[in-house]
């Protein structure tokens, strides 16, 4: 055979997003000779791994290899064989694994070790599996959406094709909602970032950015629901929890052991006189909203202003892209349109939550009941988080753009992560020749 088939003039990269509720594999592609240009990397495939998040495999680590097989095989099909050995593979685990690590560093390490061994068995250039920080998750999400929107580019050719046209180079803020955490990241206007933990400095394509970011662990939609249930069951008079965040007629039995399994509910934990309780939906948006607000401690703020729980938040500035579960939930509820005001969103949520469970099941027969039952809570939670948590108003609501994909690539942290690890975001404006690696961030 010939001495290594001449490589295609394109390159590929794989990033696995090991989230709290599931794992997704993303395949990216870019022209080899344009590595340092902005906007040239695009997503060619997303493969959702069947099953839960990797943190759920803590008692069955031997099943991780099989769990990852289908999507890794899909990657082998999509990427030309001649490129496999040169294709980097990265796995980043987010808040689900952060929570597991809080419970047991040993168990988290064991899961990651098996993940690493499984992924290294494939014929790719496996570069490691790690738990990324909340700060990284926020930063890479911000990089992704601004890269895809052409905000780092000086070339005006972009502005005829990107959505959310703003005709300027002002970056978008990033709002990311997962199952176990939520991130807010943006460039504040001439504002000192009072908390060093929330400050990031980037130099990208010759421009400096002072970025604010924070990740709220336990405030992803799934963990927020567990928190709310743990809080509300404290004051229930018996093993029936009448819950305004579920549709009228909805019933579900919850094990107390499951409720207290997560570190997110520890602050509400108490000895209950029962092992199980039953959620009975009453479907009332206003009451649900009020219950959710009790999860946000706004009574304490050591800074000029805070989001909640004493976390500094500068005044909101500019447009925001809201993605991941912000998008999925609002898309299901048909509330992603730019034309829908915050008041209209609230009205629609009131109507949706009040609909009887039997009616909802009939209307959305193709949707799994587990997910379907939680849209009332999730939609209400999103409104509560954005309005009371982050201080968006009816007026600034129009600056939130619910984004699934930009130019065919999913909005999320994975693209930014890969761009950084493959040194594809130069600190300076690229010259006609590629820069040495020493100039990268």
């Amino acid at each position: 055979t010939q001495n290594k088939a001449l490589p295609e003039n394109v390159k590929y990269g794989i990033v696995l997003d090991a989230g709290s509720s599931h794992t997704s594999l993303y395949i990216y592609k870019w022209p080899a000779e344009k590595e340092n240009d902005t906007g040239v990397v695009h997503q060619v495939e997303e493969c959702r791994v069947k099953g839960p998040g990797i943190s759920k495999f803590v008692q069955k680590v031997n099943e991780i290899g099989i769990y990852l097989t289908d999507c890794m095989e899909r990657a082998r099909e999509v990427i030309p064989r001649s490129q496999h050995q040169e294709t980097p593979v990265y796995l980043g685990a987010t808040a689900g694994m952060r929570l597991l690590r809080m419970e047991s560093e040993e168990l988290a390490d064991r899961v990651l070790d098996v993940v690493e061994r499984s992924l290294s068995n494939y014929p790719f250039d496996f570069q490691g599996a790690r738990i990324i920080t909340g700060q990284e998750e926020g930063a890479y999400g911000w990089i992704t959406i601004n890269y895809l929107l052409g905000k780092f580019s000086q070339k005006t050719r972009w502005f005829s094709i990107v959505p959310y046209e703003t005709n300027n180079q002002e970056t978008f803020g990033a709002l990311d909602l997962g199952g176990a955490s939520t991130q807010v990241t943006f460039v504040p206007q001439n504002q000192t970032i009072e908390s060093p933990d929330n400050a990031l400095q980037f130099r990208l394509y010759g421009k400096d950015y002072n970025v604010y970011t924070h990740s709220f662990l336990c405030y992803g939609k799934d963990q927020a629901l567990w928190q709310k249930l743990a809080k509300d069951i404290q004051v229930a008079s018996n093993e029936i929890l009448r819950d305004p965040c579920f549709h009228p007629g909805y019933k579900k039995v919850v094990n107390v052991s499951d409720l207290y399994k997560t570190p997110c509910t520890k602050r509400f934990e108490m000895t209950l006189p029962f092992q199980q309780f039953e959620i009975q939906g009453i479907g009332n948006y206003q009451q649900c909203h009020q219950s959710i607000l009790e999860l946000f401690n706004t009574s304490y703020c050591p800074y000029s202003q805070c989001a909640f729980n004493g976390i500094f938040l500068p005044p909101l500035q500019g447009d925001f892209g809201a993605f991941s579960a912000f998008y999925f939930v609002m898309k299901f509820l048909n509330l992603t349109s730019e034309k829908v005001s915050q008041e209209k969103v609230t009205e629609m949520m009131k109507k949706f939550c009040a609909q009887p469970w039997e009616e909802i099941k009939t209307s959305y027969a193709g949707v799994k009941e587990k997910y379907l039952s939680e849209y009332c809570f999730s939609g209400t939670y999103i409104l509560s988080l954005l309005l009371q948590g982050y201080h968006f108003t009816a007026d600034s609501w129009e600056h939130i753009h619910f984004i699934g994909k930009i130019q065919g690539s999913d909005a999320g942290w994975t693209l930014g992560y890969m761009l950084n690890l493959t040194n594809m975001i130069p600190a300076e404006q690229p010259l006609s020749t590629p820069l040495s690696h020493s100039t990268y961030v």
Epitope: T1, Q2, K4, R81, S82, H84, Q85, P123, D125
Partner: antibody, heavy 121, light 107 residues
């Protein structure tokens, strides 16, 4: 000319150790995954293990039958592949081939001439 | 691990005959199947890679086919120098595994 030349074989007692070497020439050694394959007398071929590149942190994979006893390493500056064999058993008696694939992966288009390892008391 | 089974173990043919050697994988390996020829006292030689891809320098009478679990190596007209042992190999996933071999002998 692309060439792989194994050395270091010989007679060793059960429980003993041996280190095989494979000198590569005619190609850019550091750019290719390298493998060891063995063949017992009158038997079929058995893959022993592989070592990947520096960029892959010199990752290794082994057949279950040798895991924990054999170690593959490489010295890219010397264009040499190694197989350190410890706790040898009689069933490790075989001709050991150093192999690589100069095109794509996980097949072997370049083979050494082999070196014989005999484990016997 | 993926088990590779070759049949028959021995095949007796006359020069000029058409020969088909079989290889079966215990699970689907797509087209990640490779064929080798080994003559006494020599190292194996790659004949076919990825089930059907021919190699420069290998006579055109050697061809491969198959996908999934069933594969064949065909020699359209056996020459005297083709009498040897033929091995198939799983190149899909680790551990890499070989079939037990088929010995092609003169009738």
């Amino acid at each position: 000319e692309v060439q792989l030349v194994e050395s270091g074989g010989g007679l060793v007692k059960p429980g003993g150790s041996l280190r095989l070497s494979c000198a590569a020439s005619g190609f850019t050694f550091s750019k290719y995954w390298m493998n060891w394959v063995r063949q017992s007398p009158g038997k079929g071929l058995e893959w022993v293990g592989e070592i990947r590149l520096k960029s892959n942190k010199y990752g290794t994979h082994y057949a279950e039958s040798v895991k924990g006893r054999f170690t593959i390493s490489r010295d890219d500056s010397k264009n040499t592949l190694y197989l350190q064999m410890n706790s040898l058993k009689t069933e490790d008696t075989a001709v050991y081939y150093c192999t690589t694939q100069l095109d794509l992966y996980w097949f072997f288009d370049v083979w050494g001439q082999g070196t014989t390892v005999t484990v016997s008391s | 691990e993926i088990v590779m089974t070759q049949s028959p173990a021995t095949l007796s043919v006359s020069p000029g005959e058409r020969v088909t050697l079989s290889c079966r994988a215990s699970q689907s390996i797509s087209d990640y199947l490779h064929w080798y020829q080994q003559k006494p006292g020599q190292s194996p030689r790659l004949l076919i890679y990825y089930a059907s891809q021919s190699i420069s320098g290998i006579p055109a009478r050697f061809s491969g086919s198959g996908s999934g679990t069933d594969f064949t190596l065909t020699i359209s007209s056996v020459e005297p120098e083709d009498f040897a042992v033929y091995f198939c190999q799983n190149g899909h996933s680790l551990p890499l595994t070989f079939g037990g071999g088929t010995k092609l002998e003169i009738k």
